[in-house]
Interface confidence: low
């Protein structure tokens, strides 16, 4: 705790300027008026204060605004934002996208800190949903942001926001997240024509059901192996050899290199060997010719 000491004669700050960097911590406490600091927060960022001095400035703002800082101050916090705790940030009411951008800029290039995560949470909750402009901003600063959300949180993303999502934003999403995002993407892109639709939906296909994969196989989409390998195992298993051949087009030859990696390995185990042989790729591990094939989809439904 900085002791309350009287400001030395002639040292009372009339404005926030570079002369303050020569003030000792106790002098800043005694000589800088909190209300002045609040109105001139935009200047703080341009002055090379030490971390200890920034602690004092934060302390003064905390005293002035015990219930949380107003947005006019928050927007100009600059590097002082790095001094805030998640508990401080939970008291804020941030509604302006410009404020959010200004604070994210401070943390740019670093991983998402607990402070930033709390800020984003407060902002999104305040808006009620993850709208397109917000999603645009967040994924620009943190490409993995979308995949850090729970399926429940993703459910509040409106389909219109999906237009802001880039393929790299989905790199770290797991099947549960793609299960939520895929139907939204399907809705968002429904009016696009075949080839354009596939380009847009491709990144979301890890959440696609079997029926949609079957439909895509009829559209000459030539899915690449990287996309195929990210499909749900249970969505791939019911596909026939002919459907997979149509789905992959010229990329079907890549199955050989992936024949023992999921989901290809499990799909192979479910196919008749003579059907696999028609691909001419030398895929092994199918059901030997002459064996009785149970209805595996029925078996899965029962289990």
């Amino acid at each position: 705790e900085v002791e309350k000491t009287a400001c030395p004669s002639g040292k009372k700050a009339r404005e926030i300027d570079e002369s303050l960097i020569f003030y000792k911590k106790w002098e800043l406490e005694a000589c800088v008026d909190a209300a002045l600091l609040a109105t001139q927060m935009d200047r703080v960022n341009a002055i090379p204060f030490t971390y200890e001095q920034l602690d004092v400035l934060k302390h003064k703002l905390d005293e002035l605004y015990p219930q949380g800082y107003p947005e006019s101050v928050i927007q100009h916090l600059g590097y002082l934002f790095l001094k805030m705790s998640p508990e401080d940030i939970r008291k804020w009411n941030v509604t302006s996208l410009e404020t959010l951008k200004a604070l994210l800029e401070v943390n740019k290039g670093h991983e998402m800190s607990p402070q930033v995560a709390t800020l984003i949470d407060r902002f999104v909750k305040g808006r009620g949903q993850l709208d397109k402009d917000t999603l645009d901003t967040l994924t620009a600063f943190y490409p993995g942001y979308l995949c850090s959300l729970s399926p429940e949180e993703l459910s509040s993303v409106p389909p219109s926001s999906i237009w802001a999502v880039r393929p790299q934003d989905l790199d770290t999403c797991d099947p549960r997240q793609l299960d939520v995002l895929y139907p939204k993407a399907r809705l968002a892109f429904q009016n696009m024509n075949g080839s354009e639709y596939f380009v847009k939906i491709q990144s979301f296909l890890g959440g696609a059901p079997t029926e949609d994969l079957k439909a895509l196989s009829q559209q000459n989409v030539s899915m690449d192996l990287a996309t195929f390998m990210k499909l749900r195992t249970d969505a791939v298993l019911p596909l026939t050899v002919a459907e997979v051949q149509k789905l992959l087009g010229p990329h079907v030859e890549g199955l050989k290199a992936e024949e023992r990696h999921r989901p290809v390995r499990d799909w192979i185990l479910r196919q008749r060997q003579d059907d696999l042989d028609t691909l001419g790729l030398g895929l092994q591990g199918g059901i030997p010719n002459g064996y009785l094939v149970l209805d595996l989809s029925m078996q899965e439904a029962l289990s």
Epitope: R176, E258, E259, H261, R262, R265, I268, G285, G286
Partner: antibody, heavy 119, light 110 residues
Framework: QVQLQESGGGLVKPSETLSLTCTVS??????????WSWIRQHPGKCLEWIGY???????YTNPSLRDRLKISVDTSKNQFSLKLSSVTAADTAMYYC???????????WGQGTMVTVSS | QSALTQPASVSGSPGQSITISCTGT?????????VSWYQQHPGKAPKLMIY???NRPSGVSNRFSGSKSGNTASLTISGLQAEDEADYYC??????????FGCGTKLTVL
């Protein structure tokens, strides 16, 4: 009747490389549809999946071990092997080789070989 | 990937039925029908008892059955016998294409 037998267990010094081999008898390692796997059982009884190899040489391994792990196959000897580098005491375990078929289930297991990491 | 959660021990008298639970998440047990169960007697290797949630390999007694609800799989042993006393482990395929096991349940036949 396919049988699996591990070899190479014993005492390994910290930071050294652990090397184990599993010999398959009673069947060919090259028969399609099976994935030749390694699993370990820590002293506290917990089982941990290490990874598998197919006769073609394709592997898939536990991400937590991937940087230190190499699984290889020698179809001419009907064997597959595991090498785990930079071992620590946390790698002390009973190591099993097993055959994995449909449904990600291990239907045949070796008897296991104990590996102790200690200086 | 965290280990699946199993009770440390269960017990039952001969002739009774017991159930062992195995709890995971929607990324493993809840997301796929690829749950297996293994029996392990002291000093022995594990033995497959159930695969794909409820299927029994040939040679395994029909007293052993498996089921799943949500993120929890269960192994039920009916008509408990002395030779059933062992450790039982569950395993599941996961969304990261790996396999995860439980840490085992010790079954005591009283």
């Amino acid at each position: 009747q396919v049988q699996l037998q591990e070899s190479g267990g014993g005492l390994v010094k910290p930071s050294e490389t652990l090397s184990l081999t599993c010999t398959v008898s009673g069947g060919s390692i090259s028969s399609g549809g099976y994935f030749w796997s390694w699993i370990r059982q820590h002293p506290g009884k917990c089982l941990e999946w290490i990874g598998y190899i197919y006769y073609s040489g394709s592997t898939y391994t536990n991400p937590s071990l991937r940087d230190r792990l190499k699984i290889s196959v020698d179809t001419s000897k009907n064997q597959f092997s595991l090498k785990l580098s930079s071992v620590t005491a946390a790698d002390t375990a009973m190591y099993y080789c097993a055959r994995e078929g449909a449904g990600y289930a291990f239907d045949i297991w070796g008897q296991g070989t104990m590996v102790t990491v200690s200086s | 990937q965290s280990a699946l959660t199993q009770p440390a021990s269960v017990s039952g008298s001969p002739g009774q039925s017991i159930t062992i639970s195995c709890t995971g998440t929607s990324s493993d047990v809840g997301g796929y029908n690829y749950v297996s169960w293994y029996q392990q007697h002291p000093g022995k290797a594990p033995k497959l008892m159930i695969y794909e949630v409820s299927n029994r390999p040939s040679g395994v007694s029909n007293r052993f059955s498996g089921s799943k609800s949500g993120n929890t799989a269960s192994l039920t042993i009916s008509g408990l016998q002395a030779e059933d006393e062992a450790d039982y482990y569950c395993s599941s395929y996961t969304s990261s294409s790996t396999l995860v096991f439980g840490c085992g349940t010790k079954l005591t036949v009283l």
